[in-house]
């Protein structure tokens, strides 16, 4: 969480951003909140990006003002116009690109004063893994697949019964480049699996960590997966 204060002649206002990560090809949100004002026409929101000449987005006098918008953001940004009055200056970003990563500044002017806060935005690809029993294999084998990751992640297997065991000798992980030539499909195979055990396939890069669990018993198979972003810090 980054909290910024204005320091000009006017009073300063508190602006708060949250560092976040964008999944390439999907939409992202750059979070920013501020002390609200009574009149929408008195609020100015400017989003800027370090190293970019034009503005990312500007909202003032109750409407978007994009005459100074940088080319890389054209047609790709929007504020939540109906929420500006309650202090939400968050920015929606369409079709996140790798090049969108960087330091952004959320700069606010209201009748109470000015304020700004920076936001670190990381971009990459992350997806939920799915673990299945590979019935085609000659021995009991598990197959963990996740369709989109970037940068290349690490894959680690773990088991509930053999806690702390190193499965690197009995597993094989491959990375297959997807058609857009950036993200990769992750496939990891674990051999010599025993029943009545829960196995976890953990995929991690510097942006996200995802886990796919599978519990294999004689009577049933149970699956569970979750994904967590690693860099959500507020400022």
């Amino acid at each position: 969480l980054i909290i910024g204060f204005g320091i000009s002649g006017r009073h300063s206002i508190t602006v708060t951003t949250v560092a976040s990560a964008g999944n390439i090809g999907e939409d992202g949100i750059l979070s920013c909140t501020f002390e609200p004002d009574i009149k929408l026409s008195d609020i100015v929101i400017q989003w800027l990006k370090e190293g970019v000449l034009g503005l990312v987005h500007e909202f003032k006098e109750g409407k978007d003002e994009l005459s100074e918008q940088d080319e890389m953001f054209r047609g790709r940004t929007a504020v939540f116009a109906d929420q500006v009055i309650v202090g939400n200056a968050s920015l929606r970003l369409k079709n996140v690109q790798l090049t969108d990563a960087g330091t952004y500044k959320c700069y606010i002017i209201t009748s109470k004063g000015k304020g700004n806060a920076n936001l670190e935005y990381k971009t990459g690809a992350f997806s939920m893994p799915e673990v299945n029993v590979d019935y085609n294999a000659s021995s009991e084998t598990l197959r963990c697949e996740a369709p989109r990751w970037f940068p290349q992640p690490t894959v680690v297997w773990a088991s509930q019964v053999d806690q702390g065991a190193n499965f690197s000798e009995v597993s094989n992980t491959s990375f297959e480049l997807n058609s857009e030539n950036v993200t990769m499909k992750v496939v990891s195979v674990l051999y010599n699996v025993t029943i009545n055990n829960t196995y976890s396939c953990m995929i991690e890069n510097d942006i996200a960590k995802a886990t796919g669990d599978i519990k294999v018993t004689e009577s049933e198979i149970k699956r569970r997966s979750h994904l967590q972003l690693l860099n959500s810090k507020a400022s």
Epitope: D27, H57, D64, E65, S67, Q69, R74, A78, R92, S179
Partner: antibody
Framework: QVQMQESGPGLVQPSQSLSITCTVS????????VQWVRQSPGKGLQWLGV???????DYNAAVISRLSISKDTSKSQVFFKMNSLQPDDTAIYYC?????????????WGQGTLVTVSS | IIVMTQSPKSMSMSVGERVTLSCKAS??????VSWYQQKPEQSPKLLIY???NRYTGVPDRFTGSGSATDFTLTISSVQAEDLADYHC?????????FGSGTKLEIK
């Protein structure tokens, strides 16, 4: 309320150029981009290009060598110029505006101007 | 270029029937698909944007669904005034593209 209106020549000689003006009201050209779409007789819609609030443009590669879009923000007018027209450019030409500043659906359309390319 | 394929090309339905129109994208377009209704001699009108958001003033019998490559426009109980061409379009990446349309006729 938002309104868009195209005005064009109707008939264009083959190999000549086409100029259409789209006059908008109810919003500022510094807030929204203006899209251009055409519809050939009995055919589907074809996106041709857009001029953004900043004045920068994006064109369909199929017409990029022949198309130029510009604007006069103070007059709320957008200008569409296409060169070297051929009979298969005969179509209704529309200007349109998106629902938000992110392109996710063309909510406002002009009435269209029918352009016939014939000698 | 992302190709948008609509099916069927045309259909004839009775008033009150449920209508399902399909639109398939040749590659992932997220939820950046919109649906338009075009009546004879009129400009297209936006029905659905963002794959599933009904535009202001559009009757709730029109519903959009889908993501990635498969999209559907459903008219829960078709009315006589729904006679029109229906177009889907993608605005995920350049060039923005449209399907060739579905003509809906009322029996």
């Amino acid at each position: 309320q938002v309104q868009m209106q195209e005005s064009g020549p109707g008939l264009v000689q083959p190999s000549q150029s086409l100029s259409i003006t789209c006059t908008v009201s109810g919003f500022s050209l510094t807030s929204y981009g203006v899209q251009w779409v055409r519809q050939s007789p009995g055919k589907g819609l074809q996106w041709l290009g857009v001029i953004w609030s900043s004045g920068s443009t994006d064109y369909n590669a199929a017409v990029i060598s022949r198309l130029s879009i510009s604007k006069d923000t103070s007059k709320s007018q957008v200008f569409f110029k296409m060169n070297s027209l051929q009979p298969d450019d005969t179509a209704i030409y529309y200007c349109a505006r998106d629902i938000t500043t992110i392109v996710e659906g063309f909510a406002y359309w002009g009435q269209g101007t029918l352009v016939t390319v014939s000698s | 270029i992302i190709v948008m394929t609509q099916s069927p090309k045309s259909m004839s339905m009775s008033v009150g029937e449920r209508v399902t129109l399909s639109c398939k994208a040749s590659e992932n377009v997220g939820t950046y698909v919109s649906w338009y209704q075009q009546k004879p001699e009129q400009s297209p009108k936006l029905l659905i944007y963002g794959a599933s958001n009904r535009y202001t003033g559009v009757p709730d019998r029109f519903t959009g669904s889908g993501s990635a490559t498969d999209f559907t426009l459903t008219i829960s109980s078709v009315q006589a005034e729904d006679l029109a061409d229906y177009h889907c379009g993608q605005s995920y990446s350049y060039p923005f593209t449209f399907g060739s349309g579905t003509k809906l006729e009322i029996k």
